[in-house]
């Protein structure tokens, strides 16, 4: 007798692991044999779909290799034309070992910013995510949290947060580990020890000291009055992310020295600056301070001006007298490049004999100042115009340093050769006679403050810089 279909084994919920086989059984009693169709989420499963196997006249549905997208409601419907169609439904729950779908990546971050290390996972049951730093589980705190998504968020990143991280996804079916990634914390350049200001005597050596830190380790550059340092020696050492830079200077002029620490973060740079001033203390002129010694001149600048084996006074109020006095002349000579051909040799002779004064050896070595008359000859005859300009610049503070004040003697304060011929030094290079005065440029309108002496004449009819001439 015909019999309407009856499902004797209703479908049950089936749990299946990804890539494993899952089978639904839909046992039907009926006559004649029913036609059995299967749906997933109300969509018909086609008989020829190779992912499925339908057997036992349609009563067994097998998913040959379960995918995570196979979960859903599966229903079987039986119909044989006798009575109505019958249906039974059951769920497929795809169980999945944890899988990390978006692993963390290496991160470089600047200290104080927020860092997020991603760790997106899949799995059923939903995996729990934890993190390992180095070899130890990472503890969450007010700054460090594992988000719902599994990502690790670190607020206000600190240097100590740097290190190796991995995320761990875990459920009842297993555990997955990400690869190890590196969190690098970069730190803006910062100066730990600023250079100190100094007030020193002309010709001293000073060492400016600047210490900086940062990640990466910064580089240190020195700036002198807004420009890159042109002289001085720099020594650097790096230890434990701290760079130590020492700038040794030979002081001939005051200046503002800036230590600049710089490091790079991607395409951007961070810098830190600290400045120190070097000022030159008031110093007494060599005539007033006879601390020094006699020695042969062995420099370069005054070679052509001073007698070859001249004994000169080296003033020990300088840290390195010979070097300081040589540099003093050199710098002053650079200013003389622009003066007239008449003035220049005379001024050079005056400068060299003033800075490297003739020295009288004895129990107390004594510098012999230039005779006033020779100084005035340069000031009021050979270099009248230039001297005015120089005095004007000095009063207006146009010179770069005190060096010019030191380089040029005050003629009125020098001893006269008429008082004591042995108490002052003559300039053998000022070799001229009264006839030559007619060829010199016009004198200043003011009358010379002291009569220029009848300096001895020689066969030379013009100004000479030959070291062989003598005025004695």
């Amino acid at each position: 007798l015909p019999k309407a279909p009856v499902i004797t084994t209703p479908l049950e919920t089936v749990d299946a692991l990804v890539e494993e086989v899952a089978t639904f059984m839909c046992a039907v009693e009926s006559y004649p044999q029913p036609e059995i169709s299967w749906t997933r989420n109300k969509i018909l499963i086609k008989l020829f779909d190779t992912r499925y196997s339908i057997r036992e006249n349609g009563q067994l549905l097998t998913i040959l290799s379960v995918e995570d997208s196979d979960d859903g409601i599966y229903c079987c419907t039986a119909n044989n034309g006798v009575g109505g169609a019958v249906e039974s439904c059951g769920a497929l729950q795809v169980k999945m070992k944890p899988k990390i779908t978006r692993p963390p990546i290496n991160v470089k971050i600047i200290e104080g910013l927020k860092a997020v290390l991603p760790c997106t996972t899949m799995g059923n049951p939903k995996p729990s995510v934890s993190w390992i730093k180095g070899d130890s589980p990472l503890r969450e705190n007010s700054r460090i949290a594992v988000l719902e998504s599994g990502s690790l968020r670190i607020h206000n990143v600190q240097k100590e947060d740097a290190g190796q991280y991995r995320c761990v996804a875990k459920n009842s079916l297993g555990t997955a580990y990400s690869k190890v990634v590196k969190l690098e914390v970069e730190v803006f350049a910062r100066i730990l020890r600023a250079p100190e200001s100094h007030n020193v005597t002309f010709g001293s050596f000073v060492t400016l000291h600047c210490t900086a830190t940062g990640i990466p380790v910064p580089t240190i550059t020195w700036i002198e009055n807004g420009n890159a340092v042109s002289s001085g020696s720099i020594q650097e050492s790096v230890k434990d992310r701290v760079i130590d830079s020492r700038l040794q200077l030979f002081i001939t002029k005051p200046g503002l020295y800036t230590c600049i620490a710089t490091n790079k973060h991607g395409e951007k740079f961070s810098t830190a600056k600290a400045a120190a001033t070097i000022s030159i203390a008031e110093w007494s002129k060599p005539q007033k301070d006879n601390k020094g010694y006699c020695a042969q001149y062995r420099g370069e600048v005054c070679n052509a001006v001073l007698a070859k084996d001249a004994l000169v006074f080296l003033n020990t109020s300088y840290a390195d007298p010979e070097e300081a006095q040589e540099l003093l002349v050199h710098t002053a000579w650079n200013e003389l490049k622009v003066v007239s051909p008449v003035c220049r040799p005379a001024a050079e002779a005056l400068l060299c004999n003033h800075i490297f004064q003739e020295c009288s050896p004895g129990v107390v070595p004594t510098p012999i100042p230039i005779c006033r008359e020779y100084c005035l000859a340069v000031k009021e005859l050979f270099c009248a115009k230039e001297w005015l300009v120089m005095e004007e610049k000095t009063h207006r503070g146009l010179y770069r340093s005190e060096m010019h004040l030191l380089s040029v003697p005050e003629c009125s304060k020098l001893p006269s050769m008429h008082w004591d011929p042995t108490a002052c030094a003559r300039l053998p290079h000022l070799d001229y006679n009264k006839e030559n005065l007619k060829t010199f440029p016009p004198m200043t309108s003011s009358k010379p403050s002291v009569d220029i002496p009848n300096l001895p004449s020689s066969s030379s009819s013009s100004f000479s810089v030959s070291p062989t001439y003598s005025m004695t």
Partner: antibody
Amino acid sequence: EVQLLESGGGLVQPGGSLRLSCAASGFTFSDYGMSWVRQAPGKGLEWVSAIPWQGGSTYYKESVKGRFTISRDNSKNTLYLQMNSLRAEDTAVYYCAKRSGRIAFGALDAWGQGTLVTVSS
Amino acid sequence: QTVVTQEPSFSVSPGGTVTLTCGLSSGSVTSSNYPDWYQQTPGQAPRTLIYSTDSRHSGVPDRFSGSILGNKAALTITGAQADDESDYYCGLYSYSGSKNYVFGGGTKLTVL
């Protein structure tokens, strides 16, 4: 740290030539006088030549005058010694030395490790 | 020709004081010769101790001092130590027609 690195030494026949170089670092090269000093095997130090900070003047030991030439390239931080007409008695370790200041004859306050020049047939 | 003379060898006991001298074959050593002193241990480059008669080079212990004694330059080592055993050279600036720098023959110092 002041560093002076000599190069260019070697074996040369009498009458031959060599050019020694000295690469300087760790200080402002153009602010210092420089010198060459040599030391024959088992003997004492012997000053050879000197040059002030900006070049210009040059100074030599009498026995090398006319044969040796000292020069410097401040843009390359390098000191040179061109040695021509070499003799057996020029065999020595040649040291490059920094002067304490700009002057060619200031004290020698830093030395290289030296380069050996051997003049032999 | 300028010849600079030094004692060929000298010995001192540990902790003792020794004075090495540097003279000129013709005439006296003065501050005009800017005497410098150098120390050299075998196989090493020289090291500067004293420059311009009595100025100590940076990093040199104050056991080393320079002076002019009579007509010679002098290097005095007080409280001699085993590692002071070295060759010591003096260098003098000289001017005789042209500028020169001349080393002495060196003194071998032994610390007994």
